[in-house]
Interface confidence: medium
Amino acid sequence: SLGSLAAAEPAVIAECKTRTEVFQISRNLIDRTNANFLVWPPCVEVQRCSGCCNNRNVQCRASQVQMRPVQVRKIEIVRKKPIFKKATVTLEDHLACKCETIVTPRPVT
Amino acid sequence: SLGSLAAAEPAVIAECKTRTEVFQISRNLIDRTNANFLVWPPCVEVQRCSGCCNNRNVQCRASQVQMRPVQVRKIEIVRKKPIFKKATVTLEDHLACKCETIVTPRPVT
């Protein structure tokens, strides 16, 4: 709305940088062939690029990424009883970000 | 995969708490009747609850919220020239989070 301007602080742009985000660990990251198990923990923190750039035709993108393997529990339920196994999930952390020009493919004439 | 266990650190649950997120300021928050304008800044930071809880039937939810009005620029394009106006957008920040039981409606028998 255009009302109550006095109390409002000027909005500050969310700059393009890494922020902590929550990544849900889906079961198919661990085993696509079997659904009879649970994963713990169900979510972890990752570093991801987010925010806006000063220009319309640029986008906030990761300029440097790092793969980070983490161990999770794969809890298989066999005859109503759990069997705990370790599984490795590889997470992607963004280490650095940049405002990158969006390349729109030109129509072929 | 179940391989390369040695190099992987145990995964740590992303606890239920407030984290900084990026909120895109959409034009219809400012004016639903007119599309012939731009908003600056296009995105801002907000505090939001995210993460996982220790239990299956609970969800990470905001237990305390605060409305925060911010001033943005509404840039109208009139005859190819920009006209700058001020507008207020009210953002929602989460101040505190809790793991709340998911109430699943029981089927009526």
Epitope: L38, W40, Q71, R73, I75, K80, K81, P82, I83, F84, K85, K86 | L5, A6, E9, P10, N54, N55, R56, V58
Partner: antibody
């Protein structure tokens, strides 16, 4: 204060029965799996039994299977261990302990224990 | 049934590093936890999921687990660390404890 308090221990004759209770306070009991662990005098720790947060999963050490029954009453924030056909080798301090997750995991909170003595 | 084997005793001079081992078949495939127990007291969790330290546990406590052996390491051992230490792993449907290791801090 987050705590577990066991009760119900005592002297019982071989073949007899006892029911141990564990009262939980200071946390949402219904969100946690629980276990009983025992320790014979001068010996090491021995896991006895486990129950999931909602009571749907229960399992037991081979040494007590068929004789002991674990249960819980989430409305009363209480864990139980019904011990039947007691033997001399069941003499131990019995601890109730909390798992941090609904499925189990480490034992992050322990009670102070209650002594069970099986002797004629 | 699955067994975890620990040395009955380990001695260390104050300020030195103590290492307590726990071995079991393919133990590296399971998450190992370590508990400290002082005389007349209930056990206390000092390491969980191989290498994680609960809040309130000093940084000198650390853990590792690979192959057939998990290790609890206490760096700069202090007199107050003298206690029994138990490893534990949840394997097929049961929580298994090692036999325990008595850590003596030499005076």
């Amino acid at each position: 204060e987050v705590q577990l308090v066991e009760s119900g221990g005592g002297l019982v004759q071989p073949g007899g029965s006892l029911r141990l209770s564990c009262a939980a306070s200071g946390f949402t009991f219904s969100s946690y799996a629980m276990s009983w662990v025992r320790q014979a005098p001068g010996k090491g720790l021995e896991w006895v039994s486990y129950i999931s947060d909602d009571g749907s999963l229960k399992y037991y050490a081979d040494s007590v299977k068929g004789r002991f029954t674990i249960s819980r009453d989430n409305s009363k924030n209480t864990l139980y261990l019904q011990m039947n056909s007691l033997r001399a080798e069941d003499t131990a301090v019995y601890y109730c302990a909390r798992h941090p997750y609904w499925y189990g995991g480490q034992l992050d909170l322990w009670g102070q224990g209650t002594l069970v003595t099986v002797s004629s | 049934s699955y067994e975890l084997t620990q040395p009955p005793s380990v001695s260390v001079a104050p300020g030195q590093t103590a290492r307590i081992s726990c071995s079991g078949d393919s133990l590296g495939s399971y998450f190992v936890h370590w508990y400290q127990q002082k005389p007349g007291q209930a056990p206390v969790l000092v390491i969980y999921d191989d290498s994680n330290r609960p809040s309130g546990i000093p940084e000198r406590f650390s853990g590792s687990n690979s192959g057939n052996t998990a290790t609890l390491t206490i760096s700069g051992t202090q007199a107050e660390d003298e206690a029994d230490y138990y490893c534990s792993a949840f394997t097929h449907n049961s929580d298994v404890f090692g036999g325990g290791t008595k850590l003596t801090v030499l005076q």
